[in-house]
Amino acid sequence: MMTGTIETTGNISAEKGGSIILQCHLSSTTAQVTQVNWEQQDQLLAICNADLGWHISPSFKDRVAPGPGLGLTLQSLTVNDTGEYFCIYHTYPDGTYTGRIFLEVLESSVAEHGARFQIP
């Protein structure tokens, strides 16, 4: 039975040209995390594999940085980066847990950030 839950940064906003940390945290399970995938609606941003480390997709290599932790840092944000992001935790023996973050990239010089997420 899957008992875990994923906490995310939820809905966040950031300024065009700036950077943002996408963060998820899996709790309430003793399952082993074997891999975490970061995805947009139609493409893979990055994978963090427990054995093999990080793989950043070629299309994002110049502006995506791994971490902190299992999170992902998006840099040089553009308005086109607005949209849904998913953290997909592959675990054993539970299976797959998915978290959703909505990022809005704002043109204005004042971007209201959601509450900064802290890993417990």
């Epitope: 493409q43 893979l44 994978i47 054995d51 093999l52 793989h55 997709s57 299309s59």
Partner: antibody, heavy 121, light 107 residues
């Protein structure tokens, strides 16, 4: 340039253990690569067997997990495959390959030329 | 395990033709898909990774596209050396799995 070369017996008896070695040249085992085994039965497609990472972690195909061991000998620039309790269904060409995970994910960029293994009494 | 299905399983074409091979996964693999070329008696060669990125030294007549579960591999203008068998592979999650292959033959 990186080169991989498989070696081992071409004939193994049923119920015995198949043992293969892959020797890597033109490359040091100390850097961030993983090493994989793949096989191809005669006239058929490719099957991933498993990998060993630079940190000595292994990951095996569940269909073979109970019979497979992959290990590495960094001093010899070699990694090896052991497959126990073989049957005729294990007859295949066995390939070793390199995983540059940081750059290519689970796509394998350098392969050995393959070694043919027949399981027969 | 994620099943990979390639179509067609074989294909006849002529030098200069544009050829398209499709690969479908049984589950979502995002853009974690690779394409290999294999000639008889030889080992596979990596052509495309991450669905659309060409491996170093691969001619630009080879291209890949797609995401999710449906992928396409295209050779824009067939050359004599391109007649071979082509395999897709998902590298989204282990066990990494391959398609059954598409044999490209001379018409």
């Amino acid at each position: 340039d990186v080169q991989l070369q498989e070696s081992g017996p071409g004939l193994v008896k049923p119920s015995q253990t198949l043992s293969l070695t892959c020797t890597v040249s033109g490359h040091s085992f100390t850097s961030d690569y993983a090493w994989s085994w793949i096989r191809q039965p005669p006239g058929k497609g490719l099957e991933w067997i498993g990998y060993i990472s630079y940190s000595d972690s292994t990951n095996y195909n569940p269909s073979l997990k109970s019979r497979v061991t992959i290990s590495v000998d960094t001093s010899k620039n070699q990694f090896s495959l052991k497959l126990s309790s073989v049957t005729a269904a294990d007859t295949a060409v066995y390939y070793c390959a390199r995983l540059d995970y940081g750059n290519y994910g689970g796509a394998m960029d350098y392969w050995g030329q393959g070694t043919s293994v027949t399981v027969s009494s | 395990d994620i099943q990979m299905t390639q179509s067609p399983s074989s294909l006849s074409a002529s030098v200069g033709d544009r050829v398209t091979i499709t690969c479908r996964s049984s589950q979502h693999v995002s853009t974690a898909l690779a394409w290999y070329q294999q000639k008889p008696g030889k080992s596979p060669k990596l052509l495309i990774y991450s669905a659309s990125s060409r491996y170093s030294g691969v001619p630009d007549r080879f291209s890949g596209s797609g995401s999710g579960t449906d992928f396409t591999f295209t050779i824009s203008s067939l050359q004599p050396e391109d007649f071979a068998t082509y395999y897709c592979q998902q590298h989204y999650i282990t066990p990494w799995t391959f398609g059954g292959g598409t044999k490209l033959e001379i018409k």
